[in-house]
Structures are given as structure tokens and as C-alpha cells.
């Protein structure tokens, strides 16, 4: 649930976390031939005042952080989201059982920031 | 606090919310001449399964949503963040009390999505 992630005290600042995703776990093993999985990674952490340059905060996120300080019930903190994403190439079967090599964009998190 | 935003039951799907920001409220009235404020807006809402086309989810966010379903304690849901941002032009005093017109990028949220 979302409540697993609501404690500022326990959360570190927004950053990239490592995550390997198995296509079998997603139930995609019947159509994806290769790879068996990939390092997808994910973003998590607080975007709290004071922000710093390591947090890759957009100007809007900076403004939103200041508004959140004044109105925490009304405006949420910015969220920790990917700032750089990479593609992966996947070998798969199409509807006609042909083997296709396709590049899927925005599959791997390379960097995170406050947005 | 972050806990103000942790109830899935109360939250609608990820979308843009209207927000007007006054530069006086931010304490910037001494250097910004005009405008007095601007429509910054912000993103908020759930990025829950099932995602749909209105949520502008990246491929990574789709994968992360599925992983979250299997491991909710380990991997968070994707977050609702700006997908399109606009600049604003600001008239301000520089160090030498000259009046300058400057365009600040990524200040206004135009659209939101799951990231």
C-alpha cells in the first residue's frame, strides 16, 4: 500500500535504487525470448526542503517544495521520478510466431530527480 | 507531511491540479518586479493498476506498477509527475539594480503522468 512509503523519518533523499525484473515474474515468458529479465531500477526517496543539486529538482519542483512548506495539507511535496531513461532490446514472438527484435524505449532508470 | 497523501481510497488518479503561486508568499517580492505570481499548477494522484492511456505512463512506470503489485513493501508505485512544463518570463532587479527580463524554464505544469 501507499502507506509503506509515507514516513519522512525513515526515508532517505530521492535517489535511484537497483531493481532486477524477471520477465517470468511478470508472466511475459511466453512471448519474450530474450533477455530473461533486465535491470529496470526505480526511483524512491523524499523531495523535502532543503533541496540540493544532487536531487535534480526542476524549477517547478523547487517552487512546489516552498508552497508545500507553507501549505502541507493542500499541496504535496514533489515526487521522486526518473530524469533519464534508457531503452532495452527484446527478442520476442509476434502474433504470427515470427521472431522479432524490437527496441522498447524508457525501460531502464538511469537517474532520478525531484519533479 | 507525506502522510497527508497516503490514502489510496481518498486519492483520484494522477492528474494536473490548478495552483496559483504568489511571489510575495515565497518571499521573492524584493527581486521580482513582475508578474506578482503565476499559475504554476501541480501533479497529484494515484498511479495504480490498471494504468490507462490518460495517465501518460512510461514503459518503465508500467513495469514498476506490475512489480509493485507483486512486492508492494519493496517497490513503490510510480509517482505522478509533470510530463510537460512551460517557461515563464520574469522582470527582476539584478545585482546592480538593473531591470532584467529573464525566461525561467520548467516553471508551469501543463500535463502530468505516471513516472
Amino acid at each position: 500500500s501507499a502507506s509503506d512509503y509515507n514516513s519522512s523519518e525513515l526515508k532517505t533523499a530521492c535517489r535511484k535504487h537497483e531493481l532486477y525484473v524477471s520477465f517470468q515474474d511478470l508472466g511475459w515468458q511466453d512471448w519474450i525470448i530474450a533477455p530473461k529479465g533486465y535491470a529496470a531500477n526505480y526511483c524512491d526517496g523524499e523531495c523535502s526542503f532543503p533541496l540540493n543539486a544532487h536531487m535534480n529538482a526542476t524549477n517547478h519542483a523547487i517552487v512546489q517544495t516552498l508552497v508545500h512548506l507553507m501549505n502541507p495539507e493542500y499541496v504535496p511535496k514533489p515526487c521522486c521520478a526518473p530524469t533519464k531513461l534508457n531503452a532495452i532490446s527484446v527478442l520476442y514472438f509476434d502474433d504470427n510466431s515470427n521472431v522479432i527484435l524490437k527496441k522498447y524505449r524508457n525501460m531502464v532508470v538511469r537517474a532520478c530527480g525531484c519533479h | 507531511s507525506a502522510s497527508d497523501y497516503n490514502s489510496s481510497e481518498l486519492k483520484t488518479a494522477c492528474r494536473k491540479h490548478e495552483l496559483y503561486v504568489s511571489f510575495q508568499d515565497l518571499g521573492w517580492q524584493d527581486w521580482i518586479i513582475a508578474p506578482k505570481g503565476y499559475a504554476a499548477n501541480y501533479c497529484d494522484g494515484e498511479c495504480s493498476f490498471p494504468l490507462n492511456a490518460h495517465m501518460n505512463a512510461t514503459n518503465h512506470a508500467i513495469v514498476q506498477t506490475l512489480v509493485h503489485l507483486m512486492n508492494p513493501e519493496y517497490v513503490p508505485k510510480p509517482c505522478c509527475a509533470p510530463t510537460k512544463l512551460n517557461a515563464i518570463s520574469v522582470l527582476y532587479f539584478d545585482d546592480n539594480s538593473n531591470v532584467i527580463l529573464k525566461k525561467y524554464r520548467n516553471m508551469v505544469v501543463r500535463a502530468c503522468g505516471c513516472h
Epitope: 526542503f49 532543503p50 533541496l51 540540493n52 543539486a53 536531487m55 535534480n56 529538482a57 526542476t58 524549477n59 519542483a61 523547487i62 516552498l66 512548506l69 507553507m70 530527480g113 | 508568499d25 515565497l26 518571499g27 521573492w28 527581486w31 527582476y92 532587479f93 539584478d94 545585482d95 529573464k102 525561467y104 524554464r105 520548467n106
Partner: nanobody, 121 residues
Framework: EVQLVESGGGLVQAGGSLRLSCAAS????????MGWYRQVPGKQRELVAA???????NYGDSAKGRFTISRDNAKNTVYLQMNSLKPEDTAVYYC???????????????WGKGTLVTVSS
């Protein structure tokens, strides 16, 4: 560019007080917040306290209840009043300013050179 100059560091006995000052000059108009961080050799810089232009503050765990941050917008100066100092407060204290990103996409940090605070027991 923003230039930051710290002053007020020095040697003080445990239980004593110090007041650090940080004067900002240069492109100060786009500064969003100013603050103090500290670092001891071999450890990461940690937040002591920060303050926005509107006066909102945040304190690191080590500073709560003992340190107070304030700012004088007219003088472009931020202060850190440190009371009930302990030997473990010994560190180099750095002034930080954080501003809107221009012309780039992300916010920008500026740092002072640091001022040494030594608390003897």
C-alpha cells in the same frame, strides 16, 4: 554566480555559544534558500539548518533545540546561533545557497569555503 563568505567560527568550550554568519553576493536574486551544513573528516556533509526567503526553516537532528537559523534579507546574510555546544559539534561548517536553475533544467547549489568550529571539553 553567487559568492558566499562565512565568518564566526573558532574555539569554544563545551556548553558555550557561537554565532556564524554567511554573507551572499553576486546573483543573489534567484536564491531560494540558504543554509548551513557541517562535515567532519571521513564523513558526509550533513544538514544543520536551512531557511527560505519567506522564513520557513528546517533543522537537522543534531541542531534541533540548540541551534537557530535566521536571515537578514536586506543584508543578504544568514546566521546560525549555536548554543549548548558539545565536543561532537566540532566540524567545518559550510554555508550553502540553493537557487532556481538558469539556463539549465535543475536547481543550482553554491557553497562557501567553510569555517572551522572547535568545541573543547
Amino acid at each position: 554566480e553567487v559568492q558566499l563568505v562565512e565568518s564566526g567560527g573558532g574555539l569554544v568550550q563545551a556548553g558555550g555559544s557561537l554565532r556564524l554568519s554567511c554573507a551572499a553576493s553576486g546573483s543573489i536574486f534567484s536564491i531560494v534558500s540558504m543554509g548551513w551544513y557541517r562535515q567532519v573528516p571521513g564523513k558526509q556533509r550533513e544538514l544543520v539548518a536551512a531557511i527560505t526567503s519567506a522564513g520557513s526553516t528546517n533543522y537537522g537532528d543534531s541542531a534541533k533545540g540548540r541551534f537557530t537559523i535566521s536571515r537578514d534579507n536586506a543584508k543578504n546574510t544568514v546566521y546560525l546561533q549555536m548554543n549548548s555546544l558539545k565536543p561532537e559539534d566540532t566540524a567545518v561548517y559550510y554555508c550553502n545557497s540553493y537557487g532556481l536553475g538558469y539556463p539549465g533544467d535543475y536547481g543550482i547549489d553554491y557553497w562557501g569555503k567553510g569555517t572551522l568550529v572547535t568545541v573543547s571539553s
